[in-house]
Interface confidence: medium
């Protein structure tokens, strides 16, 4: 039975040209995290594998930095980066947990972080 929950940074906003940290946290389970995938709508951004470390998708090598931790840093933001991002936690023995983050990239200098929320 899957008892864990994914806590994410929820709805966040950032300035064009700036950076943002995408962060998820798996709690309420003793399952072992074997891999975390980061996806943007229909594309893979990166993978963090417990044994092998990080794989950054070639399309994003110049703009994505691993970490902190299992999170992901997105750099040189453009308005086109606005949209949904997903953290997919592969765990043993529970299976797969998915968290969602919505990022809005703003032209102006007004960029506030949204509240944290949980996805069971």
């Amino acid at each position: 039975m899957m008892t864990g929950t994914i806590e994410t940074t929820g709805n966040i906003s950032a300035e064009k040209g700036g950076s943002i940290i995408l962060q998820c946290h798996l709690s309420s389970t003793t399952a072992q995290v074997t891999q975390v995938n980061w996806e943007q709508q229909d594309q893979l951004l990166a993978i963090c594998n417990a044994d092998l470390g990080w794989h950054i998708s070639p399309s994003f090598k110049d703009r994505v930095a691993p970490g902190p931790g299992l999170g992901l840093t997105l750099q040189s933001l453009t308005v086109n980066d606005t949209g949904e991002y997903f953290c997919i936690y592969h765990t043993y023995p529970d299976g797969t947990y998915t968290g969602r983050i919505f990022l809005e990239v703003l032209e102006s200098s007004v960029a506030e972080h949204g509240a944290r929320f949980q996805i069971p």
Partner: antibody, heavy 118, light 107 residues
């Protein structure tokens, strides 16, 4: 355990398009665990990576073949495919489909020989 | 593009002997990104080692991998008749490349 099986014509004429399909069994092609790739091996020679696709549709190709290659995924059939256009005799090879963890290729099809000849 | 050079091209040994196969990269490769495969005639390659030193599922412990940076080694501690085959190293940097292979033949 994953099993992969290539299918498609064994003979293709020069300048035409080579088309192969890989059917995946023992697991879902929609798994975010895997990339789905193609590798080829000319007779008596070494291995050359062609490209891969992620289940969400993002692709990455060997730069030397990029202009001629298309890899697509059909999640409803648990298949992915390779198209290589404007083939020449140099494209004659055994073509393998394989699953990749992003770092290495862990499951392979048995391979299918494609000969380019008129 | 990272070029992998394997040596020797052919290695002639007898069953029971120790085999040492080398793979040298043209630039530094993360250990996580180095794998070894075995290929027998008419068969697909089979993953032996990943992450430079981790054995794949079902691979006997006589196979071991080591190395870092630009120099990697596959060692078969005591050759069995079924080990005679072609061995390839493979790396993942920004794209996948394979070495040209080492043929391990019976002496």
């Amino acid at each position: 355990q994953l099993q992969l099986q290539e299918s498609g014509p064994g003979l293709v004429k020069p300048s035409e398009t080579l088309s192969l399909t890989c059917t995946v069994s023992g697991g879902s092609i929609s798994s975010s665990r895997y990339f789905w790739g193609w590798i080829r091996q000319p007779p008596g020679k070494g291995l050359e990576w062609i490209g891969y696709i992620y289940y969400r549709g993002s692709t990455y190709y060997n730069p030397s073949l990029k202009s001629r290659v298309t890899i697509a995924v059909d999640t409803s059939k648990n298949q992915f495919s390779l198209k290589l256009s404007s083939v020449t005799a140099a494209d004659t090879a055994v073509y393998y489909c394989a699953s990749s963890s992003a770092w290495y290729f862990d499951y392979w099809g048995q391979g299918t020989l494609v000969t380019v000849s008129s | 593009e990272i070029v992998l050079t394997q040596s020797p091209g052919t290695l002639s040994l007898s069953p029971g002997e120790r085999a040492t196969l080398s793979c040298r990269a043209s630039q530094s490769v993360s250990s996580s990104y180095l794998a070894w495969y075995q290929q027998k005639p008419g068969q697909a390659p089979r993953l032996l080692i990943y992450g430079a030193s981790s054995r794949a599922t079902g691979i006997p412990d006589r196979f071991s991998g080591s190395g870092s940076g630009t120099d990697f080694t596959l060692t078969i501690s005591r050759l069995e008749p079924e080990d005679f085959a072609v061995y390839y190293c493979q790396q993942y940097g920004s794209l996948y490349t394979f070495g040209q292979g080492t043929k391990l033949e019976i002496k």
